[in-house]
């Protein structure tokens, strides 16, 4: 008799990443009978919510429901109706909401309550919204990329199933750049993690991992730019800020009230004799780089070595996956290739930043001007952060892999978060039972 395929027995999960600049919804799918296997969960959909991050709704919470509608309705379409009630939904908010909570716990709670109210009214198994810690964000990003790269699998393979795979069980470090924070997470080589706050211990699939992680709040690309502007306007002689991080000919008016709205600029706040100032781009990579370096305090370190601002950082070890804005920015600049050396990246940035704004606008006519105008800063910031902040060198640069997706799933903290909350990463290696799950009868 002919073998007949059984109906697909799958499960789904939804995670919303409520970032500082926007919210994204991810739908994951996996075979129900293989929940504890490594590498079986994959992303089937990403939906980017139109609009800003949820922290921007603090004065208009009644608009949150409409804001989330399109992506939640998309989830209803993608996931079969019969699975809706069993599909868990999680929302994790990151540094944008951490900053709002620093300003006002009450306002942050109001936003989260209204977000929860909106998400509770869909026919899924909503599990709540919360602000995840920077440590969690780093840890879940590290879990995600290593899960997708097959690093937790105990089976050694003679062939490579994913890009970047070095065919050993050495885990990749994770470098995550958001709008409001940045995370660095990796397993140091035989190095004591000198600060307990930066140490994580995991037992995954029967193996112990001692992981270093740190999240630098206010050092995401958007907040870093606000910091830089607040620092530089302090020494401006008038309401004109000649800024090397913007293209020559670029002009933009900034409200001082907007500049000082974020807790990230508090350390630079001063009474200015004007309410607005104008950024005038001069497009000079070297000067931009120098200005950015002033955001990193490297004069103080209470440990054997530090990243910046007195934060312990062990010696870098192994390969790193750089994702989120690290990837988006470098992809736009066409600098994600493994073959591009750090020196070449710096040269390309020098040329890019020096290009006149009118020329840039013509070359990238399809890109929103707000984003387009900031790529010179963002690219320079990435180089500064990786080289001076985290102490990558021209030699170790080749160990950084700019990653958007792995096996069709976005690199980022959301998959690791869901794997953890659904208990899909066992502490011990599951017993191999190859004959217990037959696909055909």
């Amino acid at each position: 008799t002919q073998n007949k395929a059984l109906p697909e027995n799958v499960k789904y999960g939804i995670v919303l990443d409520a970032g500082s600049s926007h919210t994204s919804l991810y739908i994951y799918k996996w075979p129900a009978e293989k929940e504890n296997d490594t590498g079986v969960v994959h992303q089937v959909e990403e939906c980017r919510v139109k609009g800003p991050g949820i922290s921007k709704f603090v004065q208009k919470v009644n608009e949150i429901g409409i804001y989330l509608t399109d992506c939640m309705e998309r989830a209803r379409e993608v996931i079969p109706r019969s699975q809706h009630q069993e599909t868990p939904v999680y929302l994790g908010a990151t540094a944008g909401m951490r900053l709002l909570r620093m300003e006002s716990e009450e306002l942050a709670d109001r936003v989260l309550d209204v977000v929860e109210r909106s998400l509770s009214n869909y026919p899924f198994d909503f599990q709540g919204a919360r602000i995840i810690t920077g440590q969690e964000e780093g840890a879940y990003g590290w879990i995600t990329i290593n899960y997708l790269l097959g690093k937790f699998s105990q089976k050694t393979r003679w062939f490579s199933i994913v890009p970047y795979e070095t065919n050993n069980q050495e885990t990749f470090g994770a470098l995550d750049l958001g709008g409001a924070s940045t995370q660095v997470t990796f397993v140091p080589q035989n190095q004591t993690i000198e600060s307990p706050d930066n140490a994580l211990q995991f037992r995954l699939y029967g193996k112990d991992y001692n992981v270093y992680t740190h999240s630098f709040l206010c050092y995401g690309k958007d907040q870093a730019l606000w910091q830089k502007l607040a620092k530089d306007i302090q020494v401006a002689s008038n309401e004109i800020l000649r800024d090397p991080c913007f293209h020559p000919g670029y002009k933009k008016v900034v409200n001082v009230s907007d500049l000082y709205k974020t807790p990230c600029t508090k350390r630079f706040e001063m009474t200015l004799p004007f309410q607005q100032f104008e950024i005038q781009g001069i497009g000079n990579y070297q000067q931009c780089h120098q200005s950015i370096l002033e955001l990193f305090n490297t004069s103080y370190c209470p440990y054997s070595q530090c990243a910046f601002n007195g934060i312990f950082l062990p010696p870098l070890q192994g390969d790193f996956g750089a994702f989120s804005a690290f990837y988006f920015v470098m992809k736009f600049l066409n600098l994600t290739s493994e073959k591009v050396s750090q020196e070449k990246v710096t040269e390309m940035m020098k040329k890019f930043c020096a290009q006149p704004w009118e020329e840039i606008k013509t070359s990238y006519a399809g890109v929103k001007e707000k984003y387009l105008s900031e790529y010179c800063f963002s690219g320079t910031y990435i180089l500064s952060l990786l080289l001076q902040g985290y102490h990558f060198t021209a030699d170790s640069w080749e160990h950084i892999h700019f990653i958007g997706k792995i096996q069709g799933s976005d690199a980022g903290w959301t998959l690791g978060y869901m794997l953890n909350l659904t208990n899909m990463i066992p502490a011990e290696q599951p017993l191999s039972t190859p004959l217990s799950h037959s696909t055909y009868v």
Epitope: D109, R110, L112, D113, V114, E116, R117, L119, S120, N121, Y122, P123, F126, Q127, G128
Partner: antibody, heavy 119, light 107 residues
Framework: EVQLVESGGALVQPGRSLRLSCAVS????????VHWVRQAPGKGLEWVAV???????DYNAAFMSRFTISKDNSKNTVYLQMNSLRADDTAVYYC?????????????WGQGTTVTVSS | DIVMTQSQKFMSTSVGDRVSITCKAS??????VAWYQQKPGQSPKLLIY???YRYSGVPDRFTGSGSGTDFTLTISNMQSEDLADYFC?????????FGGGTKLEIK
């Protein structure tokens, strides 16, 4: 087992105040929202107010100036403070738990407490 | 405010009947509608949410349908224990509003 028990209902004169309590068990107020819904004699249901798990509140505009919802997580109790009561506030008042974390439909209701406003 | 209208205040039924109770919203509420059953002297019980999703433990003879402005609660095989008031509720926007109720009676 999830339970909500209302208390505090009474016969009061117009213009007076009353505080209703809703003692909950089987779930925690830090994990779920609680609503107050009322039902006038022989009438349908009317939504009054909600308090969500972090303490945010919303009201039916018809009651906003006179009624206040609050909670004490440590006592597992939600309150409805009702001021300037009128004859048309006469009803059975129910507290109800959100079916999902903070949803606007209700999977468990209390047995109700009767408020009669009359001179 | 969104008005939820249950045009039939009373419906006469017999055991075994297929009964359909309707509810109309004054404006589009998507599928943000719940149905409750209330027996005399008791508090309401949730039957259906999101217009068509049966709440756990509710017998499968109860089904909900509709979207936008028109909604129906159907009891496919009326039982004597189903004699009660039935209310629809919209939760698409605040204030939450209920229909006036439909009372099922025996013929």
């Amino acid at each position: 087992e999830v339970q909500l028990v209302e208390s505090g209902g009474a016969l009061v004169q117009p213009g007076r105040s009353l505080r209703l309590s809703c003692a909950v068990s089987g779930f925690t107020l830090s994990n779920y929202g609680v609503h107050w819904v009322r039902q006038a004699p022989g009438k349908g249901l009317e939504w009054v107010a909600v308090i969500l798990r972090r303490g945010s509140t919303d009201y039916n505009a018809a009651f906003m100036s006179r009624f206040t919802i609050s909670k004490d997580n440590s006592k597992n109790t939600v309150y409805l403070q009702m001021n300037s009561l009128r004859a048309d506030d006469t009803a059975v008042y129910y507290c109800a738990k959100t079916a999902v974390v903070a949803g606007d439909y209700f999977d468990y209701w209390g047995q109700g407490t009767t408020v009669t406003v009359s001179s | 405010d969104i008005v939820m209208t249950q045009s039939q205040k009373f419906m006469s039924t017999s055991v075994g009947d297929r009964v359909s109770i309707t509810c109309k919203a004054s404006q589009n509420v998507g599928t943000n509608v719940a149905w409750y059953q209330q027996k005399p002297g008791q508090s309401p019980k949730l039957l259906i949410y999101s217009a068509s999703y049966r709440y756990s433990g509710v017998p499968d003879r109860f089904t909900g349908s509709g979207s936008g402005t028109d909604f129906t609660l159907t009891i496919s095989n009326m039982q004597s224990e189903d004699l009660a008031d039935y209310f629809c509720q919209q939760y698409n926007s605040y204030p939450l509003t209920f229909g006036g109720g439909t009372k099922l009676e025996i013929k």
